[in-house]
């Protein structure tokens, strides 16, 4: 109508998808009677009657809104349930009396998108690409209206940058009317981006205000050429013979280049390629002193066939040679003296010490051991240990046996053995001397001799316990070129009062196993009363 005031802006009603929109007819009483109102939806400038109010009673018109409209607030408000994105339009109420007036409402619909799904280029990005490559995608599904996307690198928003950064966003409309946004980040990356954290952020609006959702942070596989190659040895620190040593080639490129490890031949000074395992690691196990030398690594880029050489690395496998002792098999008379000398070579300074084998007692710190006024007890083992103090575990030893000339020497002079009549006894007798003695028994039985070491012998005798044997006892005699010596075993009959709770234990060097004469397989070790050992 000419001269009529311009239509006021529609009232804004904001609502989330799925909820109920309350459309309040804002006509004043002077503009119209709310008991007689028509409601319209306006889509593409076309009005469609959707609801009538007559005498305060509401009636839906057939069509898309038929099932979702109802009156509230004594007829002043129209409720639209289950709001969808398609409901985003203008609704107007029109009063019929006293004259036709209308009130317009703009319905705005919102839905938060799902969590953004970020995906990284599964093949990675080479730094030498000629143009920006697809780095990652960000998908925000089922939002309304279309959310805005912002890409971040290391917490800073990424801006479009000619030939460097390009963000390509597109959207699709689902059958529900909701939008799915896909954004592709294209960029030319540099080596430093290998550790960069990328994420995307979706910005969207709800009736409650502006919101955002962030994706997880991702790193992008970045490929860049090798510039430097170096060798790494494990374990670090001083190496010794016997260690497991790993020599590996490392490079600062991704993917790692193809490697080979070479060792300089000390005589020809030529580099000779070593055989590495499937992982390109040279494993020296056990490491030997021959593994010492100069190693280097060569790396090839298989695309360009350009090779890079590492700085050479000197490898030192520390060692101690076999230990030599002189004299090697010493023999001495009682009362004489002996000097034992120990020698060894090493890649480091050596420390020597002499230990008594039987007791591990340290006798001397140094390569020379002097023994004076030798007694029979001085016979036996002496161990020289050559060690590198700066490298724990690097040592070699040599054992030397000293023999003292002398007649046989018995482990015990006499011993009592508890027995039962008609049992088979297992008796043992031990003697030492130089030259090594032989042992004989004064009774018939099955005897067997065992050499314990060059100066010591153990004889065992199986004999049947008889009344005569109980009377006489048993003697063992040890003899060599320098004399003889005897031990006596007294046999005592066991009765029940003699046995103690630990009667199956043995003491001393002599074990006596008694078994019934009729049951050869059944053996029981009888208890011997402890006696002080007599020697000589």
């Amino acid at each position: 109508v000419p001269g009529e005031a311009e239509q006021p802006a529609p009232e804004l009603v904001e609502v989330e998808v799925g909820s109920t929109a309350l459309l309040k007819c804002g006509l004043s009483q002077s503009q119209g009677n709310l008991s007689h109102v028509d409601w319209f939806s306006v889509h593409k400038e076309k009005r469609t009657l959707i609801f009538r109010v007559r005498q305060g009673q509401g009636q839906s018109e057939p069509g898309e809104y038929e099932q979702r409209l109802s009156l509230q607030d004594r007829g002043a408000t129209l409720a639209l349930t289950q709001v969808t994105p398609q409901d985003e339009r203008i609704f107007l109420c029109q009063g019929k009396r006293p004259r036709s007036q209308e009130y317009r409402i703009q319905l705005r619909v919102y839905k938060a998108p799902e969590e953004p799904n970020i995906q990284v280029n599964p093949l990675g990005i080479p730094v030498n690409s000629k143009e920006p490559e697809e780095v990652a995608t960000c998908v925000g599904r089922n939002g309304y209206p279309i959310p805005q996307v912002i890409w971040y690198k290391n917490g800073r928003p990424l801006k479009e940058e000619k030939n460097r950064v390009h963000i390509q966003s597109s959207q699709t409309v689902e059958s529900s009317g909701l939008y799915t946004l896909q954004s592709i980040l294209k960029a030319q990356l540099v080596k430093e981006d290998k550790d960069a954290q990328f994420y995307c952020e979706l910005n969207y609006r709800l009736p409650s205000g502006n919101h955002m959702k962030e994706s997880r942070e991702v790193t992008v596989p970045v490929f860049y050429p090798t510039e430097k190659v170096w060798l790494e040895v494990e374990p670090v620190g001083m190496l010794k013979e016997g260690d497991r040593v790993e020599i590996r080639c490392l490079a600062d490129g991704n993917p790692p280049p193809h490697f080979s490890i070479s060792k300089q031949n000390p005589s020809t000074r030529e580099a000779e390629e070593e055989t590495t395992n499937d992982n390109g690691v040279l494993v020296l196990e056990p490491a030997r002193k021959e593994h010492s030398g100069r190693y280097e690594c060569q790396a090839w880029n298989l695309d360009t066939m350009i090779s890079l050489l590492s700085e050479p690395q000197e490898l030192l496998v520390n060692y101690v040679s076999d230990v030599r002792v002189s004299p090697a098999a010493p023999e001495r008379q009682e009362g004489s003296s002996l000097t034992l000398t120990c020698e060894a070579e090493s890649s480091q300074d050596l420390e020597f010490q002499w230990l008594r084998e039987e007791t591990d007692q340290v006798l001397e710190r140094g390569p020379v051991l002097q023994l004076h006024d030798l007694k029979r007890e001085a016979g036996g083992g002496y161990r020289c240990v050559a060690s590198v103090p700066s490298i724990p575990g690097l040592n070699r030893t040599q054992l030397v046996k000293l023999a003292i000339f002398g007649p046989p020497w018995m482990a015990f002079k006499e011993r009592k053995v508890w027995v039962k009549e008609n049992m088979v006894l297992n008796l043992s007798c031990e003697a030492s001397g130089h030259p090594r003695p032989t042992i004989s028994w004064n009774v018939n039985g099955t005897a067997s001799e065992q050499d314990q070491d060059p100066q010591r012998v153990l004889s065992t005798l199986n004999v049947l316990v008889t009344p005569e044997l109980l009377e006489t006892g048993v003697e063992c005699t040890a003899s060599n070129d320098l004399g003889k010596n005897t031990s006596i075993l007294f046999l005592e009959l066991v009765n029940l009062t003699t046995l103690t709770p630990d009667s199956n234990t043995t003491t001393g060097l002599s074990t006596s196993t008694a078994s019934p004469h009729t049951r050869a397989n059944s053996t029981s070790t009888e208890r011997k009363l402890p006696e002080p050992e007599s020697r000589g």
Partner: antibody, heavy 116, light 106 residues
Framework: QVQLKESGPGLVQSSQTLSLTCTVS????????VSWVRQPPGKGLEWIAA???????YYNSAFKSRLSISRNTSKSQVLLKMNSLQTEDTGMYFC??????????WGQGVMVTVSS | DIRVTQSPSLLSASVGDRVTLNCKGS??????LAWFRLKRGEAPKLLIY???SLQTGIPSRFSGSGSGTDFTLTITSLQPEDVATYFC????????FGAGTKLELK
């Protein structure tokens, strides 16, 4: 509409080089990457190589250095070369379009037989 | 390399059945998984991408679900034309495929 078509010799002698061509239509090779995938008889699918929209090339390390992928954007063709062929390389060879990281369109495939 | 394990390798079902195919990644691949249908003499067809997004033109009886390591392709009402071999593929790191599930009619 988007289409991909593989072509190449059906039969190749072992130790020879295989050359395959993937001719595309309905999209530009500067907008989408292309991958080659193969399926040996009675077996699963195996990714071989790819060329990105930006022209970067990628290879499956299992093929060592037997592969070469390239493209001719003006002819809308992606080429795959595989040398030192063995009988185990027999199978159906497919090319597929990237969108941008999954494969949304594939060719029908070309059967390659390696004879000894 | 990320391994993808598919199960079952063979599945017999009747027309109208609800069919479920499984795919398991050897590590977390988030939602970087696609499902394909492969018929002899035809180009492989993308059914599902991003684990649960239906490719344009694919009937709504197909749906995908899962995230992380465990994924499922469901056909709500099996049709005769669905007889094929189905493959899943991860594209989180490189490209690897499952060994396939052959779907046949009972």
């Amino acid at each position: 509409q988007v289409q991909l078509k593989e072509s190449g010799p059906g039969l190749v002698q072992s130790s020879q080089t295989l050359s395959l061509t993937c001719t595309v239509s309905g999209f530009s090779l500067t907008s989408n990457g292309v991958s080659w995938v193969r399926q040996p008889p009675g077996k699963g699918l195996e990714w071989i190589a790819a060329i990105s929209s930006g022209g970067s090339t990628y290879y499956n390390s299992a093929f060592k250095s037997r592969l070469s992928i390239s493209r001719n954007t003006s002819k809308s063709q992606v080429l795959l070369k595989m040398n030192s062929l063995q009988t185990e390389d027999t199978g159906m060879y497919f090319c597929a379009r990237h969108r941008p990281f999954y494969f949304d369109y594939w060719g029908q495939g070309v059967m390659v037989t390696v004879s000894s | 390399d990320i391994r993808v394990t598919q199960s079952p390798s063979l599945l017999s079902a009747s027309v109208g059945d609800r069919v479920t195919l499984n795919c398991k990644g050897s590590q977390n691949i988030y939602k970087s998984l696609a499902w394909f249908r492969l018929k002899r003499g035809e180009a492989p067809k993308l059914l599902i991408y991003d684990a649960n997004s239906l490719q344009t033109g694919i009937p709504s009886r197909f749906s995908g679900s899962g995230s992380g390591t465990d994924f499922t392709l469901t056909i709500t009402s099996l049709q005769p034309e669905d007889v094929a071999t189905y493959f899943c593929q991860q594209y989180y790191s490189g490209y690897t495929f499952g060994a396939g599930t052959k779907l046949e009619l009972k």
